[in-house]
Amino acid sequence: KSPVFGPQEVSSVEGNSVSIKCYYPPTSVNRHTRKYWCRKGASGRCITLVSSEGYVSSNYAGRANLTNFPENGTFVVNIAQLSRDDSGHYKCGLGINSRGLSFDVSLEVSQGPELPNGTEVYTVDVGRTVTIKCPFKTENAPKTKALYKKIGQTSVLVIDSRNYVNPNYKDRIRLRIPGTGQLIFTVVIDRLRLSDHGLYLCQAGDGSNRDEKNADLQVLEPEPELVYEDLRGSVTFHCALGLEVANVAKFLCRVNSRETCDVVINTLGKRDSAFEGRILLNPQDKDGSFSVVITGLRKEDEGRYLCGAHSDGQLQEGWPIQAWQLFVNEESTIPRSPTVVKGVAGGSVAVLCPYNPKESQSLKYWCLWEGAQNGRCPLLVESQGLVQEQYEGRLSLLQEPGNGTFTVILNQLTTQDAGFYWCLTNGDTRWRTTVEIKIIEGEPNLKVPGNVTAVLGETLNIPCHFPCKFSSYEKYWCKWSNTGCQTLPSQDEGPSEAFVNCDENSRLVSLTLNPVTRADEGWYWCGVKQGHFYGETAAVYVAVEEKKVAGSRYVSPAKADAAPDEKVLDSGVREIENKAIQDPRLFAEEKVVADTGDQAGGSRASVDSSSSEEQGGSSK
């Protein structure tokens, strides 16, 4: 007896799709061995049609796939565009077709119900519109036109040209009689319901000379599109409901165990709190289509999702919908990274952002999720060097450590920086991730002057005090510009008095500018790192003024002024149009910030480094 299990009999109709789920014991060997779907021939041999190793037979090309879910001990075979030729005996199994674990499946594809001769078949999804065409002869042109629904042996009048409308079809049906010469009338039914399903009869005239035409209306609940995404990754639901509902409120909902549908997000401003910080509803195009992006996928996000349109912003019968079944793969290619990063007011965070390592050349972005209305995510920084103006001097995107991870550093933190941020690239959209920054009680670990004024032509020495716990870290000074932070030479000056409870391992690292030039004006960062992994940073702004007094200036924290006020985003910022979801900007506001001056060259003093105990504040 094989431990593989599945449906023994699958019955469907031509043109339809099937999704065959096979179950296997999820042992380590079974999870990683080959999975296959094969057809049994007369000889008893089983010919592979599709396998987990990527093979698809020519007969199945473009219409079938096999997806393994190792964590569940299941694999799913999807076959679309069924024909009668697909009827037969199959096996789903593990290992080798001829000997291995398998399960027999019988697939029967039928033609569908027998219909009266000349019946026209209309197959339409629930909520959509159907136009039934009814031909007639010239002599019946002036006579009554009508549409009946056949229920058992009786015919129930639905609509006629004398303005009768059956109450079940009120406000959603119309009969159109064309101008002279056109011998066809049409009946248009909007917002189709499942109960509209059935056989209809068009009639023109009466008596033995009347014209009749049968129409079989099949109203289908949309087959859910199967979507497989990785844990911690991102999914995009593209929803195209048609022009008829272009100006109607849109929604995405998730079907619950009671088979009702809980709103996840809608265009009326409603959003499920479980998706806070990780969902956006992209603005709709002129044709009424829209898309919803969900990042930071969790196992509990699995389920059936419907998008739709209705003035209430929620599911109502007879309105168009689209369906997806989302599966979240726990054996994810997307590495674990902290979903919450904590920093203190005045301090900094270093956020690690994963990206598809096959796309190292892709442009990297970081945006701030805003929950108002449908959500938006204005870009704050990108790898080409653009930084939003109000983040000047305190935000940088670094390509390090590379190989599937980039780093974003944000310093001079305030409580207003708390919130959700998205890491994204212009490549694989499934690698979008979300991180929440929380501002907690505490003091920054690095101490630098708040504001420094340097004198042209003289020497400037800027101290940066470190606590003992950073003794093994590499320390650096860099000059910030909107394209990054260029490392500068610095000097390790031994013990610091800034941390009274600290032992002699506390350090003071200084930056010396000698002589000061106009180009030295700008933001400087003092920071710690371990290899390519960045830790805390502190920023100081250096203003340069004309010589007033001779001599060198040494700035101590006691004399430091407050950091300059942050610039407020000007009202002239333009909103970037979102081109579906290929545009990574996600309603980004874009502002090119002028470079803050030449990047100073030189090499920094070497400082010891070893393993890190903390990255970008504590990450829990």
Epitope: S12, V13, E223
Partner: nanobody, 127 residues
Framework: QVQLVESGGGLVQPGGSLRLSCVAS????????MAWFAQAPGKEREFVAA??????????YYADSVKGRFTVSGDNAKKTLDLQMKDLKPEDTALYFC??????????????????WGQGTQVTVSS
């Protein structure tokens, strides 16, 4: 409220046949999966057969012990489920339960994957 009502149970001789029926009322959905489970005295509830629907496709599942002897059928729209039992054996004696669930996901053999249950109908196979 939701009700699943089984019928058709009874006493039958080994080798005989029975047809069980189940009608669901009050379900907040057109059930996407319905199943039969059997519980013999002092034993766990065991999977017998199930049928799942997605659109105009149906999927029928059977326990190894009933393959070729039992046939499951049903109507998604009418929320009905039938089990034609042939060549009955004494070990088929049990209380037969009808179960329903809103979607066709999850292993159909696991009783925890069904949300609604009937009270059961007794089948006794004895000479």
């Amino acid at each position: 409220q939701v009700q699943l009502v089984e019928s058709g149970g009874g006493l039958v001789q080994p080798g005989g046949s029975l047809r069980l029926s189940c009608v669901a009322s009050g379900l907040p959905f057109s059930s996407s999966r319905m199943a039969w489970f059997a519980q013999a005295p002092g034993k766990e509830r065991e999977f017998v057969a199930a049928i799942g629907w997605r659109g105009r496709t149906s999927y029928k599942y059977y326990a190894d012990s009933v393959k070729g002897r039992f046939t499951v059928s049903g109507d998604n729209a009418k929320k009905t489920l039938d089990l034609q039992m042939k060549d009955l054996k004494p070990e088929d004696t049990a209380l037969y339960f009808c179960a329903a669930h809103p979607n066709d996901d999850g292993d159909p053999r696991i009783s925890g994957n069904y949300q609604y249950w009937g009270q059961g109908t007794q089948v006794t196979v004895s000479s």
